[in-house]
Interface confidence: medium
């Protein structure tokens, strides 16, 4: 903590000017008014202050404000909020999103730091729910920040949001929030035409149920292999090899080099070598002609 | 073009006055604070006096304070360098610099002042 | 007052040369240090500010590094009308010092 010395005759300020770069640490303490400072917050972010400086100008602000920061300060702090705690933080109330995108544009290009994690998460709390204007902002700044939520918090994201996501949005997210995002995607797109459905379905396939890619199936997607290897293994096993070629297209080709990957492993060892001898693709580890298969899943529902 | 002109340099006697202009173009100049750095004649640079943009603050180096003045005025971009009791070791080019951000940029081409009896 | 001391104070170089000028400050300055190079009878000219950030429209071959209180800046490949004099400057608080320069002559 600065200690309290007298300003020096002279050195009072008048205002935040570019000139105070040049106060040392002490003369800022006794000579900037926290009043003036707040009411002129604006000002700060276009002056270049040293750490050592705006550690002084954030020790005025938190006397001023003990309870936290009002969002009409939090909204000009700049690279002052580089140096805020997540403790901070917690004691903001920001609910406008132009105050939102002023501070991320301070971290942009970094990875998310605890600070703007916390702020993002007051952020969300105080809305009730992740709008898509939100949404649309973060994952602007964040391409990875939908992934980074819990199957709980991405519960709260509405369908129309949806709109909102790009498929780079989801390339880290895992089975469990693919299925929560999924059915979201699924309402959400519901009214376009089967193309531009696919198109659109894509990113989200990593939590569609069996019965949904049955349905693609039937209307010629001519899925990626990428996209095919991120399905849900035990939504792949139940399909057939007529429905996973329809499914494919001319992509089915590339089986070949996944066999031994999961889902296509897995799903290898469920169709009848039979049936993967029609593909021409030299698929092997499928069930030998003459074996009967049990469905042990039916029988154990059954019993 | 940023562009910065000093003028009224010249001849003066030990103990003399002279007020130095510098004339700015190309930029708003209310918005950046305005210094006088200088050279004697074969030396280094000094800097000389700092004035911020609303003229709240003002700073001056050791070896002129008390007898050197800075000013400003913005209606007319122009600065000011109002040098009293001036002495042989005030001899140099003074140059008219804007402050951006820490850095001294750009320079204007200075003008000289010579203290000589 | 935070004294700032250049060496050497000239050096001898021919063209494509690689070139070293060092500054040191008397306590530390952080980052905050810029370099400018200044031809006879002319203006200085911003090179470098905060220590290694190259102004806009300054050849590559210009370079600067360090924090604290040692810095150099460097010119990998030195050409004609890069012989001129170079200053460091601290901008970390007033009053605002300079190096006291390194002339760069034709070897």
């Known amino acids: 903590e600065v200690e309290k010395t007298a300003c020096p005759s002279g050195k009072k300020a008048r205002e935040i000017d570019e000139s105070l770069i040049f106060y040392k640490k002490w003369e800022l303490e006794a000579c900037v008014d926290a009043a003036l400072l707040a009411t002129q917050m604006d000002r700060v972010n276009a002056i270049p202050f040293t750490y050592e400086q705006l550690d002084v100008l954030k020790h005025k602000l938190d006397e001023l404000y003990p309870q936290g920061y009002p969002e009409s300060v939090i909204q000009h702090l700049g690279y002052l909020f580089l140096k805020m705690s997540p403790e901070d933080i917690r004691k903001w109330n920001v609910t406008s999103l132009e105050t939102l995108k002023a501070l991320l544009e301070v971290n942009k290009g970094h990875e998310m730091s605890p600070q703007v994690a916390t702020l993002i998460d007051r952020f969300v709390k105080g809305r009730g729910q992740l709008d898509k204007d939100t949404l649309d902002t973060l994952t602007a700044f964040y391409p990875g920040y939908l992934c980074s939520l819990s199957p709980e918090e991405l519960s709260s994201v509405p369908p129309s949001s949806i709109w909102a996501v790009r498929p780079q949005d989801l390339d880290t997210c895992d089975p469990r929030q693919l299925d929560v995002l999924y059915p979201k995607a699924r309402l959400a797109f519901q009214n376009m035409n089967g193309s531009e459905y696919f198109v659109k379905i894509q990113s989200f396939l990593g939590g569609a149920p069996t019965e949904d890619l049955k349905a693609l199936s039937q209307q010629n997607v001519s899925m990626d292999l990428a996209t095919f290897m991120k399905l849900r293994t035990d939504a792949v096993l139940p399909l057939t090899v007529a429905e996973v070629q329809k499914l494919l297209g001319p992509h089915v080709e590339g089986l070949k080099a996944e066999e031994r990957h999961r889902p296509v492993r897995d799903w290898i060892l469920r169709q009848r070598q039979d049936d993967l001898d029609t593909l021409g693709l030299g698929l092997q580890g499928g069930i030998p002609n003459g074996y009967l298969v049990l469905d042990l899943s039916m029988q154990e529902a059954l019993s | 073009e940023v562009q910065l002109v000093e003028s009224g340099g010249g001849l003066v006697k030990p103990g003399g006055s002279l007020r130095l202009s510098c004339a700015a173009s190309g930029f708003t100049f209310s918005s950046y604070s305005m210094n006088w750095v200088r050279q004697a004649p074969g030396k280094g640079l000094e800097w000389v006096s700092s004035?911020?943009?609303?003229?709240?603050?003002?700073y001056y180096a050791d070896s002129v304070k008390g007898r050197f003045t800075i000013s400003r005025d913005n209606a007319k971009n122009s600065l000011y360098l109002q040098m009293n009791s001036l002495r042989a070791e005030d001899t140099a080019v003074y140059y008219c610099?804007?402050?951006?951000?820490?850095?001294?940029?750009?320079w204007g081409q200075g003008t000289l002042v010579t203290v000589s009896s | 007052d935070i004294q700032m001391t250049q060496s050497p104070s000239s050096l001898s170089a021919s063209v494509g040369d690689r070139v070293t000028i060092t500054c040191r400050a008397s306590q530390s300055i952080s980052s905050y240090l810029n370099w400018y190079q200044q031809k006879p009878g002319k203006a200085p000219k911003l090179l470098i500010y905060?220590?290694?950030s190259l102004q806009s429209g300054v050849p590559s071959r210009f370079s600067g590094s360090g924090s604290g209180t040692d810095f150099t800046l460097t010119i990998s490949s030195l050409q004609p009308e890069d012989f001129a004099t170079y200053y460091c400057?601290?901008?970390?608080?007033?009053?605002?010092?300079f190096g006291g320069g390194t002339k760069v002559e034709i070897k």
């Open positions: 905060a220590a290694s």
């Open positions: 400057q601290q901008s970390y608080s007033t009053p605002l010092t």
């Open positions: 004035i911020s943009s609303s003229s709240s603050y003002i």
């Open positions: 610099a804007r402050l951006r951000g820490r850095v001294f940029d750009p």
